[in-house]
């Protein structure tokens, strides 16, 4: 990994004690100042592995509310607009991390989760499994 | 919002100033128990989208290392393997938040942080505009 | 906002060549493509010719390949379609379009007519 030096002027927060913990300023920044209006507000409509977006609320957890994808079809919509099953939709996952509330009910002390999200699918050719 | 009962056993880190700051358990909870090895491993290859990884590497973010998806195509892939300029590869997009050290260089100090990750790519019909 | 001017269509005799323009401005995408689409009475629209902006790959209809030729000039932000041998199959309204990823921006066409 990359050392970094230590900023003299950093709070004196470290604690030997494992697990470790850190202080975070909730005040979040938006780095997205680029970010394009069209950019994929209604591709869930518009793909050929079209999928619907299912609202996820935890009190205990930050974000509390995280959307989830999950496609429409087993198949992906073909020219014609019909269903073809010689394709599969498949839902793009990616890991995110979440602030959850430990010990809970907590305002002000959270531990980093590890969570899976469905953000959207996509069409694949599916891969034939010979069985006996 | 949902108001949650405050745990009479949480740490007094209240602080009254805003921006708010709180404490936060680095050894991070994998929720992730259930996930299927074969999830989404290799759909970048097999999608009529197909998209490329880039590693994002910042020393100053937890995490420091994200993959940013980029298409491989304008158009998507037909049936015959070749391009088709009828449809287009689209990225889609998700908000995740990263923990920015701050001050720099600090190891115990941190800003949530927004920022826009490309997870994969889908199949879409463009939307056509009509110019002057 | 993208803009699309085109010229070069005309009236021409079969065999004969005709050179389609087209200058787009505003585009701000790195990844796009330009092209031709032409639609003749009665018929759908088609995706005639296209060359990918990052890469100058070219794409063609069955219906033009060995005939037309499309390139672009970058420095002048002109996209051209140079159209040989030309039959009375290739009349039609001729479209230029700029494409960018979910997007395709059309302008209002130039007609291309073809007499025997």
């Known amino acids: 990994g990359i050392t970094i030096p230590r900023n003299p002027g950093c709070p004196n927060s470290e604690d030997k004690n494992f697990p470790r913990t850190v202080m975070v300023n909730l005040n979040i920044h938006n780095r997205n100042t680029n970010t394009n209006p069209k950019r994929s507000s209604d591709y869930y409509n518009r793909s050929t592995s079209p999928w619907n977006l299912h609202r996820n609320e935890d009190p205990e957890r930050y974000p509390s509310v995280i959307w989830e994808a999950k496609c429409r079809h087993l198949g992906c919509i073909n020219a014609d607009g019909n269903v073809d099953y010689h394709m599969n939709s498949v839902p793009i996952q990616q890991e995110i991390l979440v602030l959850r509330r430990e010990p809970p009910h907590c305002p002000n002390s959270f531990r980093l989760e590890k969570i899976l999200v469905s953000v959207g699918c996509t069409c694949v050719t599916p891969i034939v499994h010979h069985v006996a | 919002g949902i108001t949650i009962p405050r745990n009479p056993g949480c740490p007094n880190s209240e602080d009254k100033n805003f921006p708010r700051t709180v404490m936060v358990n680095l050894n991070i909870h994998n929720r992730n128990t259930n996930t299927n090895p074969k999830r989404s491993s290799d759909y970048y290859n097999r999608s009529t989208s197909p998209w490329n990884l880039h590693r994002n590497e910042d020393p100053e973010r937890y995490p420091s290392v994200i993959w940013e998806a980029k298409c491989r195509h304008l158009g998507c892939i037909n049936a015959d393997g070749n391009v088709d300029y009828h449809m287009n590869s689209v990225p889609i997009q998700q908000e995740i938040l990263v923990l920015r050290r701050e001050p720099p260089h600090c190891p115990n100090s941190f800003r949530l942080e927004k920022i826009l990750v490309s997870v994969g790519c889908t199949c879409v019909t463009p939307i056509v505009h009509h110019v002057a | 906002q993208v803009q699309l001017v085109e010229s070069g269509g005309g009236l021409v005799k079969a065999g004969g060549s005709l050179r389609l323009s087209c200058v787009v401005s505003?585009?701000?995408?790195?990844?796009?493509?330009m092209g031709w689409y032409r639609q003749a009475p009665g018929k759908q629209r088609e995706l005639v010719a296209l060359i990918t902006s990052r890469s100058g790959d070219t794409h063609y209809s069955d219906s033009v390949k060995g005939r037309f030729s499309i390139s672009r000039d970058n420095a002048k932000n002109t996209m051209y379609l140079q159209m040989n041998s030309l039959n009375p199959d290739d009349t039609a309204v001729y479209y230029c379009?700029?494409?960018?990823?979910?997007?395709?921006?059309m302008a209002q066409g130039t007609q291309v007519t073809v007499s025997s």
């Open positions: 505003g585009h701000t995408s790195e990844i796009s493509a």
């Open positions: 379009v700029h494409n960018e990823p979910g997007h395709l921006y």
